[in-house]
Interface confidence: low
């Protein structure tokens, strides 16, 4: 009968052959007179086989990532006679695998949106990178998955690629952050391959800052003649936020006289002075308020960030007009 | 600090050879890929050979291939380039310059000053 | 081979102005793409790579965009020390190819 072990072959040996094993019959008595023959894909090309001996050779670099097995033929036959010595055979030549496949992340570019201040341990993204390597062999492709660019404030769990928040972070700083996440095979161990991929992280607005006014001063004028309803000018805050929580709301805070209102340009953010009642430049000539400035919308969460609402002063004077 | 020093340049006929050696210092060297490129006088940068880290893999620009050979020692933190069959467009500084992070993903980050080749007769 | 165009071939700026470099690959290489920046006599020096990642030592001045084929380098306010020669470069694919260089002089 015939006499074999199991074929296997690395993948991608450099080597101009490989001996991969010895192919005989039980008959054989070493006196060179079995003649041993390859058939099937691959013979003579890719695996040869020693006529006298049945040692088989693979005689260039395979890839298994190509093609991860060979199946052949073998026959052996009576030089003298000619005639079979055993059936022809079936055989499998396995290519086995090296860490010669870089982990690849296939769904690239990445892109994720998380609020700002999120707690540390948010979920941000995961990433997932694959290895052609044969998941089978050894730790060729195992991956682990590490940051190269993205500390403090990211963190990697090195099994998932799930990607999280490790310190909070506010918007206002900076409003978006490039991630770079690598995955190497071999679980991280020596002769291990590498692939990395860029994750564009954008921060979305909270509402985590107050509305604050420009100037601690403003001085109007309003005319003695001016009718009621009368806008005499307008006052200013600025917010760091964006959209709407950077809408906000103007009120008087202090107004003893009761002349004046304030109402809130939602277009331009501007709080407009309005003249409640008539002025009399005779019976007073100058007037002092003071407004304050509120974000439209504040979550009970955020509520924090608003305690005190910004205030200031606007002193405003009234101009004499001749009277018959 | 990170420095690469090229030498070995020179004038050299049509048909010979010239070995370029690069001196690096600062880092681990076996840690990082190599490579060197070349800018003739006038002209813009051309890649001429890349090796991995470990020295197990080379890779080379087809315009060199079979006549230039890319070797490092790890052990002297030197990279080498063996130039042969050497041509008149050959001529240009060639500088050597180290991977990023990652072997061959963040591209050349230190290079050295170069050092001039000349072929003509 | 991958062939990596740049454009225009020479900018001509005045300081304080911004410059926009453009680079384009042949087929898509990802954010597999440095630039690097090259002065009379020097050697080149590595400014963004990954496309978009500024290397040690890189003013936030500088920055790149773009990925697939299509790539932008953007100086926002050009300084003295920024008149010089840009070349992009692809380590997405083996060979690895520059681009042919963009000049960037004062006007």
């Known amino acids: 009968g015939w006499v074999w072990n199991q074929f296997f072959v690395p993948e991608e040996m450099n080597t101009t052959s490989h001996h991969i094993g010895q192919l005989r019959s039980d008959l054989d008595n070493g006196n060179n007179s079995f003649q041993y023959k390859l058939l099937g894909a691959g013979a003579g090309s890719t695996f040869i086989i020693d006529e006298r001996t049945g040692d088989i050779y693979a005689i260039q670099k395979l890839d298994r990532e190509e093609r991860s097995l060979y199946i052949l033929r073998a026959q052996v036959i009576d030089i003298a006679t000619g005639r079979a010595v055993e059936p022809e055979s079936e055989f499998v030549i396995k290519v086995s695998d090296i860490n010669d496949n870089e982990p690849k992340f296939l769904d690239e570019p990445y892109e994720a949106i998380v609020p700002e201040m999120s707690p540390e341990g948010t979920l941000v993204i995961q990433v997932t990178a694959s290895d052609a390597d044969d998941p089978s062999s050894g730790n060729n492709a195992r991956l682990l998955y590490s940051l190269l660019q993205g500390q403090p404030y990211f963190s990697v769990e090195p099994t998932t690629g799930v990607i999280r928040i490790s310190s909070k972070m506010d918007r206002e700083l900076q409003d978006e952050y490039w991630v770079i996440i690598q995955a190497k095979d071999m679980i991280g161990q020596p002769g291990a391959l590498s692939g990395t991929t860029s994750v564009l992280i954008k921060l979305s607005d909270v509402n985590d800052n107050k509305p604050i006014f420009k100037e601690s001063l403003y001085r109007l004028t309003v005319s003695e003649s001016a009718p009621t309803g009368t806008s005499i000018g307008t006052i200013m805050a600025y917010d760091n936020d964006i959209g709407e929580n950077a809408e906000m709301d103007y009120s008087i805070e202090e107004d003893d006289s009761q002349t004046f209102d304030i109402i809130t340009n939602h277009e331009t953010q501007e709080g407009i002075v309005i003249l409640k009642k008539k002025v009399d430049f005779e019976h007073q000539n100058h007037y002092g308020i003071r407004a304050k400035v509120k974000n439209h919308h504040v979550p009970e969460q955020l509520m924090k960030y608003h305690t005190e609402a910004s205030t200031t002063f606007i002193k405003i004077q009234v101009e004499d007009v001749d009277e018959p | 600090e990170v420095q690469l020093l090229e030498s070995g340049g020179g004038l050299v006929q049509p048909g010979g050879s010239l070995r370029l050696s690069c001196a690096a210092s600062?880092?681990?060297?076996?840690?990082?890929?190599m490579n060197w490129v070349r800018q003739a006088p006038g002209k813009g940068l051309e890649w001429v050979s890349t090796?991995?880290?470990?020295?197990?893999?080379?890779y080379y620009a087809d315009s060199v291939k079979g006549r230039f050979t890319i070797s490092s020692d790890n052990s002297k933190s030197t990279l080498y380039l063996q130039m042969n069959s050497l041509r008149a467009e050959d001529t240009a500084v060639y500088h050597c310059?180290?991977?990023?992070?990652?072997?061959?993903?963040?591209?050349?980050?230190?290079w050295g000053q170069g050092t001039t080749v000349t072929v003509s007769s | 081979e991958i062939v990596m165009t740049q454009s225009p071939v020479t900018l001509s700026l005045s300081l304080g102005e911004r410059a926009t470099l453009s680079c384009r690959a042949s087929?898509?290489?990802?954010?597999?793409l440095a630039w690097f920046q090259q002065k009379p006599g020097q050697a080149p020096r590595l400014l963004i790579y990954?496309?978009?990642t500024r290397a040690t030592g890189i003013p936030a001045r500088v920055s790149g965009s773009g990925s697939g084929t299509e790539f932008t380098l953007t100086i926002s306010s050009l300084q003295s020390e920024d008149f010089a020669v840009y070349y992009c470069?692809?380590?997405?694919?083996?060979?690895?190819?520059f681009g042919g260089g963009t000049k960037v002089e004062i006007k």
């Open positions: 310059a180290k991977g990023g992070m990652g072997g061959y993903y963040y591209g050349m980050d230190v």
């Open positions: 600062g880092f681990t060297f076996s840690s990082y890929a």
């Open positions: 090796i991995s880290g470990g020295g197990a893999n080379t």
């Open positions: 087929q898509s290489i990802s954010s597999n």
């Open positions: 990954g496309a978009f």
């Open positions: 470069q692809q380590y997405n694919y083996w060979p690895l190819t």
